[in-house]
């Protein structure tokens, strides 16, 4: 499966924070998206390969990497002015 | 590659029919659909993967477009637990 | 029918600069990624880099960073590949070849190659 | 970077002969082989993709198995046309790493 954590995460100002997310799928493609409240998700980062991410529609105050297949860690950087959100992990073939 | 869905809301009565659309003008190898209950995360309904594609869940009815850049779910006799947030991605 | 037409060969003196391009007809360009791949005389390929005609996200092999650029223009459907403070060992023939953006799959056409010769 | 180890790095065969070309990876790439064949002043020309899928248009005397780290290509009955250079690509990570080649002679 796909697993993300921590579940609740909160920030101090200034601070950066790292968001895990793991999946065991064997799955190449690897997606961050941001969730406002009863809005639909927004794209923040992808990922079709290992070494390689190019930037959603809301990347800015973000950064990812992907080093390794099974894991595409997100930070939310000091510059993410508005960091309050739901956030999604997902992955695909 | 942004993906347009609409209507953005929709509110509609007991066992009638509606229809949901989602378009892009990027090629997409696939297009999920999801469903989204409050405070949850979205749960998975579909993938689509071949241009033309029908695929039928119950009363869901989900179609690729032949380009593979526009998608629809259609709701046959819509039930109160069908009500949530329809999310389409690719 | 896809194709990808490279410009003609070329004949650089060492330290000088050359572009060459990658001309895409038979599907839209801003679909797929397009791929460099180099081939010195009698030698395996080597991946130089690729770059999405759609946002021009790149990403280079790191022993071509600093020598190759990669950049297009979409009215034109044309790919470029830029190669500066050319040396012998940059004698070649370099390939254009396209994969599709989703998901990342191996090159599935491939331009007919432009021949560098780097020679004083 | 993923290193491929190909070989053997030539190979002369009589026509109707079986050839095998292998390619094994130093780390695992999952399905995420590619086999190309390059003729003399050609480009290369994609045979199997990821999954040991076979192009288009390519001979059913072709074919491609493996996964993990060891692989291989496989010509069923060889025929003086498949005379070529032929090339192994992982894709599973960047960058693309190619195989040093095999060349197929006529024996």
């Known amino acids: 499966g796909i697993t993300q954590s921590p579940k609740y995460l909160f920030r101090k100002e200034g601070q950066n924070v790292t968001l895990s997310c793991e999946q065991n799928l064997n799955h190449d493609a690897m997606y961050w998206y941001r969730q406002d409240p009863g809005q639909g998700l927004r794209l923040i980062y992808y990922s079709q390969i290992v070494n390689d991410f190019q930037k959603g529609d809301i990347a800015e105050g973000y950064s990812v990497s992907r080093e390794k297949k099974e894991s595409f860690p997100l930070t939310v950087t000091s510059a993410q002015k508005n960091p309050t959100a739901f956030y999604l992990c997902a992955s695909s073939i | 590659q942004l993906l347009e869905q609409s209507p953005q809301f929709l509110s509609i009565q007991e066992g009638e029919n509606l229809t949901v659309y989602c378009n892009s003008s990027s090629v997409f190898s696939s297009l999920q659909w999801y469903r989204q209950e409050p405070g949850e995360g979205p749960v998975l309904l579909v993938t689509v993967v071949t241009g033309g594609e029908v695929k039928k869940l119950k009363r869901l009815t989900f179609q690729f477009g032949d380009a593979r850049k526009d998608s629809s779910l259609h709701i046959t006799a819509a039930q109160t637990g069908d009500t949530g947030l329809y999310l389409c991605a690719g | 029918e896809v194709q990808l037409q490279e410009s003609g060969p070329e004949l650089v003196k060492p330290g000088a600069s050359v572009k060459m391009s990658c001309k895409a007809s038979?599907?839209?360009?801003?679909?797929?990624?397009m791929h460099w791949v180099k081939q010195s005389h009698g030698k395996s390929l080597e991946w130089i880099g690729y770059?999405?005609?759609?946002?021009?996200?790149?990403n280079y092999n790191q022993k071509f960073k600093g020598k190759a650029t990669l950049t297009v223009n979409k009215s034109s459907s044309t790919a470029y590949m830029e190669l500066r403070s050319l040396t012998s060992e940059d004698s070649a023939v370099y390939f254009c070849?396209?994969?599709?953006?989703?998901?990342?799959?191996?090159?599935?056409?491939w331009g007919q190659g432009t021949s560098v010769t780097v020679s004083s | 970077d993923i290193k491929m180890t190909q070989s053997p790095a030539s190979l002369s065969m009589a026509i109707g002969e079986k050839v095998t070309i292998r390619c094994i990876t130093i780390t695992d790439i999952d399905d995420d082989m590619n086999w190309y064949q390059q003729k003399p002043g050609e480009p290369p020309k994609l045979l199997f993709s990821e999954g040991n899928t076979l192009r288009p248009g390519v001979p059913s005397r072709f074919s491609s198995s493996g996964y993990g780290s060891d692989f291989a290509f496989t010509i069923e009955n060889m025929l003086s046309e498949d005379v070529a250079d032929y090339y192994c690509?992982?894709?599973?990570?960047?960058?693309?790493?190619f195989g040093a080649g095999t060349k197929l002679e006529l024996k």
């Open positions: 690509l992982q894709s599973d990570n960047l960058p693309l790493t």
């Open positions: 070849a396209r994969s599709t953006v989703v998901p990342f799959y191996a090159m599935d056409y």
């Open positions: 038979g599907y839209t360009f801003t679909d797929d990624n």
């Open positions: 770059i999405n005609p759609n946002n021009n996200h790149t």
